[in-house]
Amino acid sequence: QGGAAEGVQIQIIYFNLETVQVTWNASKYSRTNLTFHYRFNGDEAYDQCTNYLLQEGHTSGCLLDAEQRDDILYFSIRNGTHPVFTASRWMVYYLKPSSPKHVRFSWHQDAVTVTCSDLSYGDLLYEVQYRSPFDTEWQSKQENTCNVTIEGLDAEKCYSFWVRVKAMEDVYGPDTYPSDWSEVTCWQRGEIRDACAETPTPPKPKLSK
């Protein structure tokens, strides 16, 4: 997310087209309260951050309200009046959608439909990952809305599920972040379970003829 200037590394996350978080890691200034100055228009004067993030008592980031924006964040991180890092970035390319809410499961024999509340903007992928203790890795299925049907499940097996949202790379580019995963939920025979046994009962050995 942009090279370091004077040893400053930055990270930008645009949470759900609502809030922009810019954090910095500046080893040279680790005991300094750097200030963050920003503007959304290249012609305006800089405003100073009013909502700092602190780490070990010193500023380490800024949170900005930025509801549904598709423009450039111009910013400057300063030590007093001295700029130590100045840059501009298209915020939307650092989108992190919010985690799926109101996740529901609807079972029909060997299939389950996973639904959740759709987010209020488009070009997203809703990904469901699932596995049973017999699976060595997670299986995955994704759709453009939060309505994902997974077929061919074994009704006798216990399955763990979780859901996340991703921004489509074709639209938002390669630097976005997937949402946090929803909580894992476990299901067997169409009923919710506290957990799936970590180690499945080993299959009975075949008797050699």
Partner: antibody, heavy 119, light 107 residues
């Protein structure tokens, strides 16, 4: 408010390229938003063709991907549509507009320019 | 591609009436739908976005509703200047697609 104005030839021969310009006033096309082209066929059916984002990235309708190019001249605050190998089926009113990523509705439109493809 | 279907090509109404224009998506598009008004000889103008949010400057007699696959634009207290064609559009996933339009005729 942002204003958009399309310009270009109103008649193009089949197999040639259609080239249109959109001139934007009251907003810099490098400051933000996406800058799409949309066309409206006789009979009023609308089709999104593609856009160029303020960052310079483009996205096109897959049905036209092999024939379309959207570029810009930031010094003139203009963006352009080029559609190659046109046929009479490309006859339409062509609009430029402004939208934004994630919420790709078209908040501002030009007045449109009718392009006829005919020998 | 997602197909947006406006099954009524024409609707007839009178000044002061209430009319509802419908739009159906071929698959769920969440709430990522906009509505446009196109007065004859003019460019389309956005009325509603995100299914139910009025764009700035749009009179409050225009309301949008729906989610998933079924969407409605309602015009209450129809005025003579509402004589126009109305289009829905989905932006849930590209390529972004429009409905075929519904022409509102004032009796």
């Amino acid at each position: 408010d942002v204003q958009l104005q399309e310009s270009g030839p109103d008649l193009v021969k089949p197999s040639q390229s259609l080239s249109l310009t959109c001139t934007v006033t009251n907003y810099s096309i490098t400051s933000g938003y996406s800058w799409p082209w949309i066309r409206q066929f006789p009979g009023n059916k609308l089709e999104w063709l593609g856009y160029i984002h303020s960052s310079g990235r483009t996205n096109y309708n897959p049905s036209l991907k092999s024939r379309i190019s959207i570029t810009r001249d930031t010094s003139k605050n203009q963006f352009f549509l080029q559609l190659n190998s046109v046929t009479p089926e490309d006859t339409a009113t062509y609009y430029c507009a402004r939208s934004q990523l994630g919420l790709v509705f078209f908040a501002y439109w030009g007045q449109g320019t009718l392009v006829t493809v005919s020998a | 591609d997602i197909v947006m279907t406006q099954s009524q090509k024409f609707m007839s109404t009178s000044v002061g009436d209430r009319v509802s224009v419908t739009c159906k998506a071929s698959q769920s598009v969440g709430a990522n739908v906009a509505w446009y008004q196109q007065i004859p000889g003019h460019s389309p103008k956005v009325l509603i976005y995100s299914a139910s949010y009025r764009f700035s400057g749009v009179p409050d007699r225009f309301t949008g509703s729906g989610s998933g696959t079924d969407f409605t634009l309602t015009i209450s207290n129809v005025q003579s200047e509402d004589l126009a064609e109305y289009f829905c559009q989905q932006y849930n996933s590209y390529p972004y697609t429009f409905g075929g339009g519904t022409k509102l005729e004032i009796r």
